[in-house]
């Protein structure tokens, strides 16, 4: 069986301020077991945007219902975009671990650009 890949098909997305951004991500396998997280930026200072395993993220909705056991679509929508949301977003698959899950594979990233509302 081929190793799981995390696919972010869009290199960049342009969204007008106040609109909703859709960031696409799919996994090619259900294995290994473990959650998906979305981050803005890379490295130790990256910002958590959505965590499948924990928490409620009011601005973020998932495109698919992640409670369904065979789901492999981890795309998200971020509402009410502002210029402060610009950046590169990474969809990251974690492998279940003990005590902590371990980062397994990251998508290539999607750059979100925000167009100012026309005055």
């Amino acid at each position: 069986e081929e190793e799981l890949q995390v696919i972010q098909p869009d290199k960049s997305v342009l969204v007008a301020a106040g609109e909703t951004a859709t960031l696409r991500c799919t996994a090619t396998s259900l294995i290994p077991v473990g959650p998906i997280q979305w981050f803005r930026g890379a490295g130790p200072g990256r910002e958590l945007i959505y965590n499948q395993k924990e928490g409620h993220f009011p601005r973020v909705t998932t495109v698919s219902d992640l409670t369904k056991r065979n789901n492999m679509d981890f795309s998200i929508r971020i509402g009410n975009i502002t210029p402060a949301d610009a950046g590169t977003y990474y969809c990251v698959k974690f492998r279940k671990g003990s005590p902590d899950d371990v980062e397994f594979k990251s998508g290539a990233g999607t750059e979100l650009s925000v167009r100012a509302k026309p005055s």
Epitope: E54, G55, H56, T61, D65, L66, T67, D100
Partner: antibody
Amino acid sequence: EVQLVESGGGLVQPGRSLKLSCLASGFTFSDYGMIWVRQAPGKGLEWVASISSSSSYIYYADTVKGRFTISRENAKNTLFLHMTSLRSEDTALYYCARRYYGFNYPFDYWGQGVMVTVSS
Amino acid sequence: DTVLTQSPALAVSLGQRVTISCGASKSVRTYMHWYQQKSGQQPKLLIYSASNLEAGVPSRFSGSGSGTDFTLTIDPVEADDIANYYCQQSNEPPYTFGAGTKLELK
């Protein structure tokens, strides 16, 4: 076999405190969010509090906010509910339940419940 | 908060089809779950995320709906199904339950 066993209930006077425990077995406790739900005698189900797998995210019902504290010890497979300033309306059967992964997931296993009676 | 409205009771005959409804005060997308509670027992998950049958639950139970209107269907009803049924949303905090529907025999 998944098991959730609550303990620590009993009769307590208004204004006093009580600490409930829920011992989990048969699954990897640290993978699951945990929830307390209560049911007053003859009434329906009311969510009380929830805690994520690593304790990073905690939520309370408005009716208990500031009085109840949910916590967990993953090393001991145990969930807690520390209840203070108890009121007569807190009288209920308290259930612990587990929730796989994130906020949107359902409560797939429940304990048998422990009775808390607040009365003078 | 998201208020969930259920009819308080339904009288049914064994072998018939019964539909229990749950209305949400605002959209919960598909994050609606159904539980069965028999007298003196803890709740048991039947259906998760509107239409998914939980493992081990008989196929006579089914769920449907999205947004604000949801239904739990039992077809055919058996004696073992006499219980209270609760809907619960997990779209946003706070989690809320419906007041429950009591399934009774005619």
